[in-house]
Amino acid sequence: NKILVKQSPMLVAYDNAVNLSCKYSYNLFSREFRASLHKGLDSAVEVCVVYGNYSQQLQVYSKTGFNCDGKLGNESVTFYLQNLYVNQTDIYFCKIEVMYPPPYLDNEKSNGTIIHVKGKHLCPSPLFPGPSKP
């Protein structure tokens, strides 16, 4: 039996930050679980891990240097990412593993979310227009 995961198809990260909600067909309340977010079609980069131990405080970490935080809902984990670079625009996949109580469960691979990181563009000042063509 596999847990199903729903994610938004696409999100835009303004100010280099984004919130990605992973919705599961499973209630995580009073469960020991490991929710993670992975970057790339092959999910090669583990962006962020949120470890939940029953109803206690979530433990959040990244082995790959991403600034992240997590929030738990009954059937969701929301990942908050900060300080993203434009070149980190990619597809991101939610993963969930339930360790306790048995049996061990994980998810069917989701469709993922394309996170488009928008650069901060400096708008030209109207006081200093570019050279006009004659």
Partner: antibody, heavy 120, light 107 residues
Amino acid sequence: EVQLVESGGGLVQPGGSLRLSCAASGFTFSSYWMHWVRQAPGKGLVWVSRVNSDGSSASFADSVKGRFTISRDNAKNTLYLQMNSLRAEDTAVYYCARADNSSWYHFDYWGQGTLVTVSS
Amino acid sequence: EIVLTQSPATLSLSPGERATLSCRASQSVSSYLAWYQQKPGQAPRLLIYDASNRATAIPARFSGSGSGTDFTLTISSLEPEDFAVYYCQQRRNWPPTFGQGTKVEIK
């Protein structure tokens, strides 16, 4: 005026436990992430742990993971660091510091620190 | 994790002189870099955040510059109270890390 006052430091034997507290005043405590940063004698600053504004999530440096826990009581405007299985290398001055919700690791105010000495 | 290397380790100057402190990151930290001042027996104090923004109540003689991997803290004219240890810190990547410090001492 923002104030952060640490307490709870002292001398403890290796393998022992200690609980540090940080009393906050002069700002809306529940709106800020809080951190612990330590400084071994004569050494530089090292980030230890953080807790988010409502206490629901935490992170730890690899050197303390599994041994330290961080918590907060927003009703009492107090931050805590529970330190277990202490080692000699945990000897340091421990500072609490605040960071706002938009810049999680931007430490704008610090306490005066409390000294933890781990020795037999 | 990102390693921050500060140079020089010690800077010996006289009051009134200009101090230039360097911080180099092992990879780009964009502009997510802060500078702190620490005097003996005291807590660190935030001087500069996001590479070039002065924190509240910090005198104008302190300025920060740089982006990517190379950053500079400049004290335009040293006052007696500026002799201290200065640390840089990045918040671009997790975990946050600090440089080893530069001591500015009286010549």
